[in-house]
């Protein structure tokens, strides 16, 4: 009679996480009598997976009925596979004794577990940044196996190239994580922009996972200011407006100063939204000219999103004409926008009135 051989026909088996793994094992002889055991790994630290003779193995079932006469099939099924189950499994024949002794081992079957990556999480900088600045976004995904994975970055559908990606750990592991950092240059038009991290893996069957970050959470577009004098609305009154244009986010506080003294403070509430996602707002100030003997310096001061205030001034000349003539002095705009100005089309805004 030929000596018993333990046959493990599959060198490797790949299973998706959550599924069952079938590990095949047959023996070529009924001799010697003795149980089969399955181990993960070899050597003294090997882990017992199944023992035909004794023990409780809730995740393991035998594929064939091992009690049946002349049974030589000792294949097992392991349920609910996780990445932690990856490894090489050995089917080992034992010889009956006190205790049973190891007789012969199969060549082993390597079980690899295909585990899907977690949904990518994209995070941006802690503080907002202004256009023309470069900001970093990170993307993380965990728990995938095998190690091979592809990560791409997009901004509004356009693939980015300035990024660095690491997959950890470097050596063998039951599962892996990916971490990528991309650099993105902000523009004034980015309020509606999205940064997308896309992860492709063998477990996803060509349907990559995506994580997104809205640049509206990252960008700050500072306002441009323009102070103008409007035609007289009533005798001895001058109407001055402060146009606050193209700002984001909405959080904005405006203060009017007359000759350096605070006249009024208000918070932007009813704003108009531009197509690019930025906001416009307008504030009015009605100045009673007859109450002033000297020229008035009007300043529109804006604090946007907690940043240092920007301001724009307007000099209002008070003439010596008698009041009864009812003529208003022409105003001269001598101020300058400290942040620079642009020629943007403005949407209508709510007019705020204030009488002195």
């Amino acid at each position: 009679e030929e000596e018993l051989q333990v046959i493990q026909p599959d060198k490797s088996v790949s299973v998706a996480a959550g599924e069952s793994a079938i590990l095949h094992c047959t023996v070529t002889s009924l001799i010697p009598v003795g149980p089969i055991q399955w181990f993960r790994g070899a050597g003294p630290a090997r882990e017992l997976i199944y023992n035909q003779k004794e023990g409780h193995f809730p995740r393991v079932t035998t594929v064939s009925e091992s009690t049946k006469r002349e049974n030589m099939d000792f294949s097992i099924s392991i349920s609910n596979i996780t990445p932690a189950d990856a490894g090489t499994y050995y089917c080992v024949k034992f010889r009956k004794g006190s205790p049973d002794t190891e007789f012969k081992s199969g060549a082993g079957t390597e079980l690899s577990v295909r585990a899907k990556p977690s949904a990518p999480v994209v995070s941006g900088p802690a503080a907002r940044a202004t256009p023309q600045h470069t900001v970093s976004f990170t993307c993380e995904s965990h728990g995938f196996s095998p190690r091979d994975i592809t990560l791409k970055w997009f901004k509004n559908g356009n693939e980015l190239s300035d990024f660095q990606t690491n997959v950890d750990p470097v050596g063998e592991s039951v599962s892996y994580s990916i971490h990528s950092t991309a650099k993105v240059v902000l523009t004034r038009e980015d309020v509606h922009s999205q940064v997308i991290c896309e992860v492709a893996h063998v477990t996803l069957q060509g349907d990559p996972l995506r994580g997104t970050a809205n640049l509206s959470e990252t960008i700050r577009v500072p306002p441009t200011l323009e102070v103008t004098q409007q035609p007289v609305r009533a005798e001895n009154q001058v109407n001055v407006t402060c146009q606050v244009r193209k700002f984001y986010p909405q959080r904005l506080q405006l203060t009017w100063l007359e000759n350096g003294n605070v006249s009024r403070t208000e918070t932007a509430s009813t704003v108009t939204e531009n197509k690019d996602g930025t906001y416009n707002w307008m504030s009015w100030l009605l100045v009673n000219v007859s109450a002033h003997r000297d020229d008035v310096k009007l300043t529109c001061q804006v604090e946007h999103d907690g940043q240092p205030a920007v301001s724009k001034s307007h000099d209002l000349k008070v003439s010596a004409h008698p009041k009864e003539q009812g003529s208003n002095t022409a105003a001269e705009n001598t101020g300058s926008n400290e942040r620079g100005s642009s020629d943007y089309k403005d949407d209508d805004d709510k007019h705020h009135h204030h009488h002195h």
């Epitope: 001799i31 003779k53 023990g55 091992s66 006469r69 009956k96």
Partner: antibody, heavy 119, light 110 residues
Framework: QVQLVQSGAEVKKPGASVKVSCKAS????????INWVRQAPGQGLEWIAM????????HYNQIFKDRATLTTDTSTSTAYMELRSLRSDDTAVYYC????????????WGRGTLVTVSS | DIVLTQSPDSLAVSLGERATINCRAS??????????IFWYQQKPGQPPKLLIY???NRDSGVPDRFSGSGSGTDFTLTISSLQAEDVAVYYC????????FGQGTKLEIK
């Protein structure tokens, strides 16, 4: 190690029934067949029947088919053999034995239960 | 049914001598490449003990002075050098079909 512990001796009257138990330990009860064998005083071994505790499949010696019933309780790893309509020639030591190789052989034996049938 | 006949019914052998017990089946017990014959030893007041399985394979812990041979219908249990502790009744059993035992052979010391 494998152990099969049998119930104590019984004295029965002709026509009665007896139920002998065999409690297994040291192995997974449902993975191996249990055989029942008897031996009358001064006589040879006589196979009665066998049971697979995993699914209660049984095989009986035709001689005992109508009088013997094998059962198992997997929750307590115990096998039972009931013999009905007892006669005086059923007086014997009744053994349970475990088949470790699914070869329909008897690898490990209990110590036996003496059943005496006498009026 | 297969009937097993052992011979002799009893046997007396001197210590250190060879003892041979025969078992003949009424039909072949060979199947699937195996001879489905088993040998047991039973000492007084004890349950039987498996010695040989599938005709020629010694069970664990069985001294190597015990050996089994044969094929088809004729089988032999041999004790190469009889020891005092070998005094017992020896049974053959077949399981090509359902188990049946031979009538037993009583081995004594001459």
């Amino acid at each position: 190690q494998v152990q099969l512990v049998q119930s104590g001796a019984e004295v029965k009257k002709p026509g009665a029934s007896v139920k002998v138990s065999c409690k297994a330990s040291g192995y997974t009860f449902t993975n191996y067949w249990i055989n029942w064998v008897r031996q009358a005083p001064g006589q040879g071994l006589e196979w009665i029947a066998m049971i697979d505790p995993s699914d209660s499949e049984t095989h009986y010696n035709q001689i005992f088919k109508d009088r013997a019933t094998l059962t198992t309780d997997t929750s307590t790893s115990t096998a039972y053999m009931e013999l009905r309509s007892l006669r005086s020639d059923d007086t014997a030591v009744y053994y349970c034995a475990m088949d470790y190789g699914s070869l329909y052989a008897m690898d490990y034996w209990g110590r036996g239960t003496l059943v005496t049938v006498s009026s | 049914d297969i009937v097993l006949t052992q011979s002799p019914d009893s046997l007396a052998v001197s210590l250190g001598e060879r003892a041979t017990i025969n078992c003949r089946a009424s039909q072949s017990v060979r199947s699937s490449g195996y001879n489905w014959i088993f040998w047991y030893q039973q000492k007084p007041g004890q349950p039987p003990k498996l010695l040989i399985y599938l005709a020629s394979n010694r069970d664990s812990g069985v001294p190597d002075r015990f050996s089994g041979s044969g094929s088809g219908t004729d089988f032999t249990l041999t004790i190469s050098s009889l020891q005092a502790e070998d005094v017992a009744v020896y049974y053959c059993q077949e399981s090509r079909e359902l188990p049946t035992f031979g009538q037993g052979t009583k081995l004594e010391i001459k």
